[in-house]
């Protein structure tokens, strides 16, 4: 029987020729478990792996822990990789998180992190976010320092109230904080003034929810 | 902000050195860091700044010759060496992370110039 | 260098006025002004950046407004804890500078 390629990330798929942007089975690292994920083989050079998609509301974001943990939706549309393998891959070398976002009048904007991870389960999968550039705000969205994250059945944010289900989705909550990619998708002409909405605060302000966003890692020395 | 802390200030005499310091959190280690200091009951006055890996430096005209910035990242550390100090000097210093505008500060450090 | 002109340099106020700080640069500076809230024996405090973007923090009592060479800071109902001084900076052009300040104090 012909040995299986292992890759950790897209990167790896990429680097051993495998260039067309797709779903692709990824294997956690030091183990012999597998998640489905989306390669973007074409977005600045390729190589990245996608962990989170909003497009079309076709996915209901307001998930558990467990779900956020392991992932939901489907790689080539809609959703979210899981906290458990974007922890484990960003823990054995330095990543860059790119943020892709479409607001609803044909606009686009990215901000990228020149440093990327997430603690583990038992720091509530924390984000570490280091060296923001790009045009969707001078100032990280995603609060600094990062905070833990949170969902409708685990509160680990700053703030009084439950910011997960008020704002829906999980996210990395701060008091509640300038952004939630997972929040509540409204349509066209529906987008504004909406508190629970896609919020990207230093690109769009107060109240907008997008139309489209992506958030892709891929290692610092690819 | 305990995310900046300036350290290293003091009383010095006119003509005299003094190097000051500021712990960043790591996450200021792809930032540009400044310097920027008020003088007692006066207004804020941009001392300099640092690019990340310390490459690029910017220091405003008037402190040229006498006023130097560097970093040490893998101590999470800005400094300010001041040179050939005066009265005038007499200020409180902050550092200060640089977007052009500064959005975080530290809670600054006094130097008295004084004989 | 470029020179801020800031005015008024102090006002009196009660709470719930409205208040108006402006800011002249001496030169175009495309929006590329900040500007920050000071109170005693603390660092200044960030409000607004890039003319008119408020920071996530701050209430909405505070905008920013302007272009070109002229920049307002509006605080539309003042509250108690908004008796500080205020400043605006350029970051346009090298070196950095602020405006001089204006004390708002309660009348």
């Known amino acids: 029987k012909e040995e299986q390629i292992i890759f950790r990330d897209c990167a790896e798929a990429f680097k051993s020729g495998l260039t067309t942007s797709g779903t692709y089975t990824l294997t956690f690292p030091n183990s012999t478990e597998e998640t489905k994920a989306y390669c973007d083989m074409e977005t600045g050079g390729g190589g990245w792996t996608v962990i989170q998609r909003r497009e079309d509301g076709s996915v209901d974001f307001q998930r558990t822990w467990k779900e956020y943990k392991m992932g939901f939706g489907s790689p080539s549309g809609e959703h979210w990789l899981g906290n458990e393998f974007v922890s484990q891959v960003t823990n054995q070398k330095r990543y860059v998180l790119k943020i892709h976002l479409r607001d609803w009048e044909g606009n686009e904007a990215y901000s990228l992190y020149e440093h990327f991870y997430l603690s583990s389960e038992e720091f509530n999968y924390r984000i570490h976010l280091k060296g923001l550039t790009g045009t969707a705000g001078k100032i990280s969205s995603i609060s600094q320092p990062g905070n833990d994250f949170s969902t409708k059945d685990a509160d680990n944010d700053k703030c009084i109230c439950k910011c997960s289900q008020m704002l829906t989705g999980g996210w990395w909550f701060d008091a509640c904080g300038p952004s939630n990619l997972n929040g509540m998708y409204y349509p066209q002409r529906q987008n504004t003034n909406k508190f629970n909405g896609i919020k990207w605060y230093y690109w769009k302000g107060s109240g907008y929810s997008l139309k489209a966003t992506t958030m892709m890692i891929r290692p610092a020395d690819f | 902000s305990e995310h900046l802390v300036e350290s290293g200030g003091g009383l010095v005499k006119p003509g005299g050195s003094l190097r000051l310091s500021c712990a960043t959190a790591d996450f200021f280690e792809y930032d540009d860091m400044s310097w920027v200091r008020q003088a007692p009951g006066k207004g804020l006055e941009w001392v300099g700044s640092?690019?990340?890996?310390?490459?690029?430096?910017y220091l405003n005209t008037k402190f040229i010759g006498r006023f130097t910035i560097s970093r040490d990242d893998s101590k999470n550390t800005l400094y300010l060496q001041m040179n050939s100090l005066r009265a005038e000097d007499t200020a409180v210093y902050y550092c200060?992370?640089?977007?052009?505008?500064?959005?975080?500060w530290g809670q600054g450090t006094l130097v008295t110039v004084s004989s | 260098a470029i020179y801020m002109h800031q005015e008024p340099s102090s006002l009196s106020a009660s709470v719930g006025d409205r208040v108006t700080i402006t800011c002249h640069g001496s030169y175009w500076l495309n929006s590329e002004v900040a500007w920050y809230q000071q109170k005693p024996g603390k660092a200044p405090k960030l409000l607004i950046f890039?003319?008119?973007f408020k920071v996530y923090e701050v209430p909405s009592r505070f905008s920013g407004s302007g272009s070109h060479e002229d920049y307002t800071l509006t605080i539309s109902s003042l509250q108690p804890e908004d008796f500080a001084t205020y400043y605006c900076q350029q970051y346009r052009y090298h070196p950095y500078t602020f405006g001089h300040g204006t004390k708002v104090e309660i009348k």
């Open positions: 640092i690019s990340p890996k310390g490459d690029h430096k």
């Open positions: 890039d003319g008119d």
């Open positions: 200060a992370r640089d977007v052009g505008f500064f959005d975080w």
